[in-house]
């Protein structure tokens, strides 16, 4: 079972990752961002089913198309370098995931844009830090 | 369906320069990252780099750097790369391909490929 | 540099046999691999993307799967086509980089 400090440190974990997720659909959202429209045009893949942190492997999976995506937009609108932001990101997704087991990630049929796929995981933050405060 | 064809084969000296085209044709070059591949006789295969032909932003191995150029020209849907101060272990088939994230998730890997282009550097 | 070692370097089997390729990556890369068939005079082919997925057009008898930092390639029963050089690529972060290749012939 887990214990309340593995359960603390995992939700630290999450409210990084949310935090990070948000950081980036605020700069892609900047209304300064010339880069917009095509950013939009970049396909990214949703999963079926996301209510478990082993279901992080699907967003693990988007983070390259993501890494793409950043190096389209003005670094100003980021702290990071993209290389280094997706880096930091990947990081903690492999933490609360774990490297043990091979999930199979599945896809929906649709596809999303960029703002909708970010939507996505950043409710799914949410959702997981609710069930553990 | 894509293709992408490349020039022909160089025969250069060791010090000079090789500029290596590909062609996209099929679709819009600006819908693909156009990456460059090296395969020495017999060996394995070396990735070079890439650009963006949209926007011209290019990345490129570290081995390459400094004496690597990959540009597009939109215009003919055409990708180059130009390599220069060969020396005899340049001697390879130079690959280009692609990689896209505005279709399916199997093209965002090295789906494409020109029929690749035999330099040989030798004095 | 994420370093990826194929196993074996060669591999000598018969038609209708199983064939199984090893390609082991130095560090962790998630699914961020894809597998690559080549024939002598012929620009590589893709066979499997993102670890286990098979590419369009690609017969049913070649697999990928994954554990850990550990990829495997299998061809459930091979075919005459089927003898050439495999290579492994990672995508997970640049450079990228190949297997140093498996040689499947024909015993």
């Known amino acids: 079972a887990p214990t309340s400090s593995s359960t603390k440190k995992t939700q630290l974990q999450l409210e990084h990752l949310l935090l990070d997720l948000q950081m980036i659909l605020n700069g892609i959202n900047n209304y300064k961002n010339p880069k917009l429209t095509r950013m939009l045009t970049f396909k990214f893949y949703m999963p079926k089913k996301a209510t478990e942190l082993k279901h992080l492997q699907c967003l693990e999976e988007e983070l390259g198309p993501l890494e793409e995506v950043l190096n389209l937009a003005q670094s100003k609108n980021f702290h990071l370098r993209p290389r280094d932001l997706i880096s930091n990101i990947r990081v903690i997704v492999l933490e609360l995931k774990g490297s043990e087991t091979t999930f199979m990630c599945e896809y929906a049929d649709e596809t999303a844009t960029i703002v909708e796929f970010l939507n996505r995981w950043i409710t799914f933050c949410q959702s997981i830090i609710s069930t553990l405060t | 369906q894509v293709q992408l064809v490349q020039s022909g084969a160089e025969v250069k000296k060791p010090g000079a320069t090789v500029k290596i085209s590909c062609k996209v044709s099929?679709?819009?070059?600006?819908?693909?990252?156009m990456h460059w591949v090296r395969q020495a006789p017999g060996q394995g295969l070396e990735w070079i780099g890439r650009i963006d032909p949209e926007d011209d932003s290019t990345k490129y191995a570290e081995n390459f750097k400094g004496r690597v150029t990959i540009t597009a020209d939109t215009s003919t849907d055409t990708a180059y790369m130009e390599l220069s101060s060969l020396r005899s272990e340049d001697t390879a088939v130079y690959y280009c391909?692609?990689?896209?994230?505005?279709?399916?998730?199997?093209?965002?890997?090295?789906?494409?490929w020109g029929q690749g282009t035999l330099v040989t550097v030798s004095s | 540099d994420i370093v990826l070692t194929q196993s074996p370097a060669t591999l000598s089997l018969s038609p209708g046999e199983r064939a199984t390729l090893s390609c082991q990556a130095s560090?962790?890369?998630?699914?961020?691999l894809s597998w690559y068939q080549q024939k002598p005079g012929q620009a590589p082919r893709l066979l499997i993307y993102s670890a286990t997925s098979l590419a369009s057009g690609i017969p049913a008898r070649f697999s990928g799967s994954r554990s850990g930092t550990d990829f495997t390639l299998t061809i459930s029963s091979l075919e005459p086509e089927d003898f050439a050089v495999y290579y492994c690529?990672?995508?997970?972060?640049?450079?990228?980089?190949f297997g140093q290749g498996t040689k499947l012939e024909i015993k």
């Open positions: 560090q962790y890369i998630s699914n961020y």
């Open positions: 099929g679709d819009t070059i600006t819908a693909y990252y």
């Open positions: 391909t692609t990689v896209t994230f505005y279709y399916t998730r199997e093209l965002r890997w090295f789906a494409y």
């Open positions: 690529l990672q995508h997970y972060s640049t450079p990228y980089t």
